[in-house]
């Protein structure tokens, strides 16, 4: 199996009540605007065939995509939560910048690509869905990276 290195976040990142609350409030506001309840972006399918030791690397890819392709372009919306949460998630992304996998990561990229394709196919409603799942992103990062 591929070896992942530097794929760790300190648990203190996930033990800050204020920013955790803001992240969940942002997700809640966006999910109220999400009328496509049939599709789930962050779920069992995302982790299919990915070992526990590789999951932080996978979540790093999802986090970077969410920031660059969803949150930054949509960052004028869902105030005041967005302007508080984006720097926090950008900080987590920065802390995972040295998280790499030695070896083949094609199976991980395939799963992440499916998520990306789903968001792109749904257009703006896909972006809103991704924001609405920030609580799941937060929890998945926590479970995979600490």
């Amino acid at each position: 199996a591929p070896i992942s290195s530097h794929c760790r976040l300190d648990k203190s990142n996930f033990q800050q009540p204020y920013i955790t609350n803001r992240t969940f409030m942002l997700a809640k506001e966006a999910s109220l605007a999400d009328n496509n309840t049939d599709v789930r972006l962050i779920g069992e399918k995302l982790f299919h065939g990915v070992s526990m030791s590789e999951r932080c690397y996978l979540m790093k890819q999802v986090l970077n995509f969410t920031l660059e392709e969803v949150l930054f372009p949509q960052s004028d919306r869902f105030q005041p939560y967005m302007q508080e949460v984006v720097p926090f998630l950008a900080r987590l992304s920065n802390r995972l910048s040295t998280c790499h996998i030695e070896g083949d990561d094609l199976h991980i990229q395939r799963n992440v690509q499916k998520l990306k394709d789903t968001v792109k196919k749904l257009g703006e409603s896909g972006e809103i869905k991704a924001i609405g799942e920030l609580d799941l992103l937060f929890m998945s990062l926590r479970n995979a990276c600490i």
Epitope: Y18, F72, S75, V86
Partner: antibody
Framework: QVQLVQSGAEKKPGASVKVSCKAS????????MHWVRQAPGQGLEWVGW????????FYAQKFRGRVTMTRDTSINTAYMELSRLGSDDTAVYYC??????????????WGRGTMVTVSS | QAVLTQPSSVSGAPRQRVTISCTGS?????????VHWYQQLPGTAPKLLIY???NRPSGVPDRFSGSKSGTSASLAITGLQAEDEADYYC???????????FGTGTQLTVL
Amino acid sequence: QVQLVQSGAEKKPGASVKVSCKASGYTFTDYYMHWVRQAPGQGLEWVGWINPYTGGAFYAQKFRGRVTMTRDTSINTAYMELSRLGSDDTAVYYCAREPERFGDSTGQVWGRGTMVTVSS
Amino acid sequence: QAVLTQPSSVSGAPRQRVTISCTGSSSNIGAGYGVHWYQQLPGTAPKLLIYGNSNRPSGVPDRFSGSKSGTSASLAITGLQAEDEADYYCYHWDKEQSGYVFGTGTQLTVL
């Protein structure tokens, strides 16, 4: 370290003024930039914000129609332009980066302020 | 214009406890977005003192604390010191205006 450096004092006869705020020490596009003003001996007044990533700006109702906030990401600088100046626009204008409300570096970074004096 | 109302001035002797109130409405404090407090020492830029009702940024002494109830918030300072003499402002998101609003400001005098 994180720093905001503002342009120097301005004395204006009443047309318009453009104040600059150069950011350093952090990723400019990750944090909203707010503008706040304070007239001599008065309280703080929120003018608006700009999102440096999108360039989208939002202004307090009082200033809509005569304030414009822009940014130049190539030089990490935010600008605030106020037009149709009146004597009651005489104030110190501050830029302030959206505070981090997480981690051990929580706090807000402010510029030192630009004094704008409107006089005929 | 939505306003967050504060007493114009409060005073206290060294080592005493003082509180500064901030009264709003259902569109700002009552909407539950979280109240922030700023301290402005004479001739300087404001400094974030409390965020999200009761959280202290690193470096802010635990003599400063914040609380919120209904449409009002308050800042408490215990063990008052000469260097606490400053102006204090509450700051909040106002949902009706879709923007931030500062309180009217309170001047604290240490006797």
